[in-house]
């Protein structure tokens, strides 16, 4: 026979905060540490599980086959109900009835997810967006793995990501002084560095790379670096290449310079030799399979160099160099020096001896070509 | 067990074809680049072609280029050399190898067969 | 097409002995090289890949430098067992190029 349950015998609700999918324990204690008769119900008095003698029945709720409880716990008291692979709809007071007691407990379940595909390029945007029940007012915090705090209700907008930005997300969602988190893995599709600038003496071999910020089981798509000499009046397609699977084919090269591309990743291009005509800046792209948009890195590369003719020794650099870099002459083991901030130094009837040219930003070379001066004799007068 | 073996070789005259298989069993097949590398009797190794897992992509040396062709049938397990217009300098071992994992290096390698070009 | 030059082609040594042999791109191949070892009749054998990683099962005494253009292996404590001819080969792109050799001869 059951005995009613009066309003002194029905304990202060418990709030307890779930995740969408997760599992949940909803705890319930009886005073004595032994087996006793216990029902979970929901708001609706719909019995979910309960003991019938030594057994877990369970109920007509719509729980019935997410729901269980931990019957190796009964004999301590303990009659939690577990609810596997939560929904938003699972949200509701859940009482448990145990020793014509009434324990309440109010489960909110949330959900935090990325409108679109967790693999975002580099300046595009990041909404996540949080699913709650009717009726609750959760607060949203997220932090991203550079350390930047962004906060918000429902929605939450990164408006511009940045490869920084690429990592674990960590996001906390609060309700009635509780909390629970989310970790969300974003993935910034970039290349590792914007820009880079290789600095080569005039006939050295260049190499420039292209690291990518982030690693993918299968990649492919398609690229292109685009060159912009500084001597040219426009820009020309250097090489086209596909990608596929992390493997590099090349479908089209440009005569001069000839170009070797590497066939696997990272992406890596040789340039047989440093000349004058090459010098400028060059913007490699990458389009991705699936991907709107294409990922970008500049490339520049200056070349240095060193001449005599006749009386005049000159050191002429080309290519994007920027206005604080100090260009220098300077005889081995001697202070003659001639430094400037320009494109070109030159020493009119130089020494003779072993010279450096120098490309010099604040102090530290960037690029050094050595220059033999020999010894010129007047020529003898002729009788 | 990871294995590859060789068949196909033998005697030609020059300017004749010949085809070699290579059987492969205990990897995915379609998920390496292979090779034929050839080995002249007393000299040192040559690279003669190659095909790309992913894409299928073919290569060749330009000893061999227009002459040669590489192949595969996945559904075999079997990886092909079609040699056509044969030469005296052709005459070789021919290994077949298997790439490793994001071309780790030839990380398996046939015991080879022989392909003798003379009239 | 890159060419690979291999150095020495032949060397005389004793066990015990540390070896080194090298090999220089024509051009910049990062580290995508292998080395490998091979004995009279049989097939090739990787020993190291991508310039300085051991293959699985290969002793440690075999190992790999370099970057770029230069590369070496080195045998630390020469075995019997080791005497043999090496090749180095670039996968850096096709067609790929062995060295010439190096014959490694028991004095």
């Known amino acids: 026979e059951q005995k009613l349950i009066s309003e002194e015998d029905l304990a202060a609700k418990k709030v307890v905060l779930g995740k969408k999918g997760d599992t949940v324990e909803l705890t319930c204690n009886a005073s004595q540490k032994k087996n006793t008769q216990f029902h979970w119900k929901n708001s609706n008095q719909i019995k979910i599980l309960g003991i019938q003698g030594l057994f877990l029945t369970k109920g007509p709720s719509k729980l019935s086959d997410r729901a269980d409880s931990r019957k190796s716990l009964w004999d301590q008291g303990c009659f939690s109900m577990i609810i596997k692979n939560l929904k938003i709809e699972d949200s509701d007071t859940y009482i448990c009835e145990v020793e014509n007691k009434k324990e309440e407990v109010e489960l909110l379940v949330f959900g935090l997810t990325a409108n679109s595909d967790t693999h975002l390029l580099e300046g595009q945007s990041l909404t996540l967006t949080l699913e709650s029940p009717p009726g609750s007012s959760p607060s949203v915090k997220c932090r991203s793995p550079g350390g930047k705090n962004i906060q918000g209700g429902r929605t939450i907008s990164v408006p511009q990501l940045e490869r920084q930005d690429s990592g674990t997300w960590t996001c906390t969602v609060s309700q009635d002084q509780k909390t629970v988190e989310f970790k969300i893995d974003i993935v910034v599709l970039a290349f590792q560095k914007a820009s880079s600038t290789v600095y080569k003496k005039e006939g050295e071999q260049v190499e420039f790379s292209f690291p990518l910020a982030f690693t993918l089981e299968k990649l492919t798509g398609s690229g292109e670096l685009w060159w912009q000499a500084e001597r040219a009046s426009s820009s020309k397609s250097w090489i086209t290449f596909d990608l596929k699977n992390k493997e590099v084919s090349v479908k089209r090269v440009t005569q001069d310079p000839k170009l070797q591309m590497g066939k696997k990743l990272p992406l890596h291009l040789t340039l047989p030799q440093a000349l004058p005509q090459y010098a400028g800046s060059g913007n490699l792209t990458l389009a991705l399979e699936a991907k709107t948009g294409k990922l970008h890195q500049e490339v520049n590369l200056v070349v240095m160099r060193a001449t005599q003719f006749q009386e005049n020794l000159t050191c002429e650099v080309w290519g994007p160099t920027s206005p604080k870099l100090t260009l220098s002459l300077k005889l081995e083991n001697k202070g003659a020096t001639v430094s400037k901030q320009a494109k070109a130094v030159w020493v009119l009837n130089p020494e003779a001896g072993m010279w450096q040219c120098l490309l010099s930003d604040s102090g530290q070379v960037l690029l050094e070509s050595n220059i033999k001066v020999v010894p010129t004799w007047p020529t003898p007068v002729q009788p | 067990e990871v294995q590859l073996l060789e068949s196909g070789g033998g005697l030609v005259q020059p300017g004749g074809s010949l085809r070699l298989s290579c059987a492969a069993s205990?990897?995915?097949?379609?998920?390496?680049?292979m090779s034929w590398v050839r080995q002249a009797p007393g000299k040192g190794l040559e690279w003669v072609s190659g095909i790309s897992g992913s894409v299928g992509s073919t290569y060749y040396a330009d000893s061999v280029k227009g002459r040669f062709t590489i192949s595969r049938d996945k559904s075999k397990n079997t990886l092909y050399l079609q040699m056509n217009s044969l030469r005296a300098e052709d005459t070789a071992v021919y290994y077949c190898?298997?790439?490793?994992?994001?071309?780790?290096?030839?990380?398996?390698w046939g015991k080879g067969t022989t392909v003798t070009v003379s009239s | 097409a890159i060419q690979m030059t291999q150095s020495p082609s032949s060397l005389s040594a004793f066990v015990g002995d540390r070896v080194t042999i090298t090999c220089r791109a024509s051009?910049?191949?990062?580290?995508?090289l292998g080395w490998y070892q091979q004995k009279p009749g049989k097939a090739p054998k990787l020993l190291i890949y991508a310039a300085s990683s051991l293959q699985s099962g290969v002793p440690s005494r075999f190992s790999g430098s370099g970057s770029g253009t230069d590369f070496t292996l080195t045998i630390s404590s020469l075995q019997p067992e080791d005497f043999a001819t090496y090749y180095c080969l670039q996968d850096y792109n096709y067609p790929y190029t062995f060295g010439q050799g190096t014959k490694l001869e028991i004095k």
């Open positions: 051009q910049g191949i990062r580290n995508d």
């Open positions: 190898a298997k790439e490793g994992y994001d071309w780790s290096g030839m990380d398996v």
């Open positions: 205990g990897f995915t097949f379609s998920s390496y680049a």
